[in-house]
Interface confidence: medium
């Protein structure tokens, strides 16, 4: 039995609902009473949701999943996952058994946009050209881990003396702190760009030191 899922990962924002698409081609005369549908986590084989003996057997996954019962008879075995969390990220297997059986796995990629970075300066006064300054760029509550880029006012990348740390909170979202140590020129603008690699979302801020 051919079971079809999207090749590309399904990207879902934290807190939103995601649909994991799965379809099969029912034979003529197919009856839902014949269908055994199982959604499970691919790696651990943990049951997520099932349909058997003509009935939705319900969610086994924190009561956050649902099928599309009106579409099952047409071969739509998709799963709706509500209030997506970071912990949901991974591969889900859609297993369909009628007489023959088949399965396919679909990947869920969870994402959360990073906040606009805040910039702090240390020291933050009485600065003169030639002084060494520490600029901290902080952005919060994103997923997955960010890519951080620094550049000067002319757009030249600044790669030396950069230290970036990322810490996950209880929800699995990352707070990113990137520190640039730089020797001040006559006047300078320094920009920090925090990129979410999944969402291709850039959040940036800059500071000008005169």
């Amino acid at each position: 039995l051919e079971v079809q899922v999207p090749e590309d990962p399904v990207v879902a924002l934290v807190g939103t609902d995601a649909t994991l698409c799965c379809s099969f081609s029912p034979e003529p005369g197919f009856s839902l009473a014949q269908l055994n549908l199982i959604w499970q986590l691919t790696d651990t084989k943990q049951l997520v949701h099932s349909f058997a003996e003509g009935q939705d057997q319900g969610s086994a996954y924190a009561n956050r999943t649902a099928l599309f019962p009106d579409l099952l008879a047409q071969g739509n075995a998709s799963l709706r996952l509500q209030r997506v969390r970071v912990a949901d990220e991974g591969s889900f297997t859609c297993f369909v058994s009628i007489r023959d059986f088949g399965s396919a796995a679909v990947s869920l990629q969870v994402a959360a946009p990073y906040s606009k970075p805040s910039m702090t300066l240390e020291p933050n006064k009485d600065l003169r050209p030639g002084d060494t300054v520490t600029i901290t760029c902080s952005s919060y509550q994103g997923y997955p881990e960010a890519e951080v880029f620094w550049q000067d006012g002319q757009g030249v990348p600044l790669t030396g003396n950069v230290t970036t740390s990322q810490m996950a909170n209880e929800q699995g979202l990352f707070d990113v702190h990137s520190i640039l140590r730089v020797v001040l020129g006559a006047n300078g603008t320094y920009s920090c760009l925090v990129r979410n690699p999944v969402l291709q979302q850039d959040a940036h801020s800059s500071v000008t030191i005169t």
């Epitope: 034979e27 197919f30 009856s31 009473a33 014949q34 055994n36 691919t42 003509g54 058994s97 059986f101």
Partner: antibody, heavy 119, light 113 residues
């Protein structure tokens, strides 16, 4: 309650044909396959094939393709198996069985029909 | 065709004893994706139709006493009766529905002393 009621025993002559019946009740007949299984005296079970009453599609074990013909009558919720060119080797109890769903294990069985082939 | 070989062909035990019987398949019945084996066990008492006991190698059918346990995966399967009762006198068959044609083992006849 799902029930499969099979026809009574049959004594037939070699070379003849026989038609066994299996009347289903307690569920929607057109929703599930009816399987047929043979059990010869003091022997194991042999799967013959299934028929899906919804559209009449069938699947046979190659061994029985020229021996058994499966049909259904939706109006009476009855499945039939005709056995042709009978020999003493065909003397057996024949069961009809319904799966739990799709092509799964057999959760419901008829009581069996004994077919005796003898001159 | 997939061949299922059951052993022993018969065994005699006393009431209360533990019984194990084996079913070996000529090829794996494991569907890796869901880590389940397509093997069922049936009980056939004298003069009766077979009755489903276990499916997916280890899932007990509703209403089947918990003294019946199925185990195994791939090619080697076992049916265990933890404490035999007189009413367990029967022939036990395994069956695969992994691949057509569906096939049964030759059976294990359980007799009571």
């Amino acid at each position: 309650e799902v029930q499969l009621e099979q026809s009574g025993p049959d004594l037939v002559k070699p070379g003849a044909s026989v038609k066994l019946s299996c009347k289903a009740s307690g569920y929607t007949f057109t929703d599930f396959d009816i399987n047929w299984v043979r059990q010869r005296p003091e022997q194991g079970l042999e799967w013959i094939g299934w028929i899906f009453p919804g559209d009449g599609s069938t699947k046979y074990d190659e061994t029985f393709k020229d021996k058994a013909t499966l049909t259904t009558d939706k109006s009476s919720s009855t499945a039939y198996m005709q056995l042709s060119r009978l020999t003493s080797e065909d003397s057996a109890v024949y069961f009809c069985a319904r799966p739990r769903y799709g092509g799964s294990w057999f959760a419901y069985w008829g009581q069996g029909t004994l077919v005796s082939v003898s001159a | 065709d997939i061949v299922l070989t059951q052993s022993p062909s018969s065994l005699t035990v006393s009431v209360g004893e533990k019984v194990t019987m084996s079913c070996k398949s000529s090829q794996s019945l494991l569907y890796n994706t869901i880590q389940r084996s397509y093997l069922a066990w049936y009980q056939q008492k004298p003069g009766q139709s077979p009755k489903l006991l276990i499916y997916w190698a280890s899932t007990r059918e509703s209403g089947v006493p918990d003294r019946f346990t199925g185990s195994g995966s791939g090619t080697d399967f076992t049916l265990t009766i933890s404490s035999v009762k007189a009413e367990d006198l029967a022939v036990y068959f395994c069956q695969q529905n992994y691949q057509y044609p569906w096939t049964f083992g030759g059976g294990t006849k359980l007799e009571i002393k």
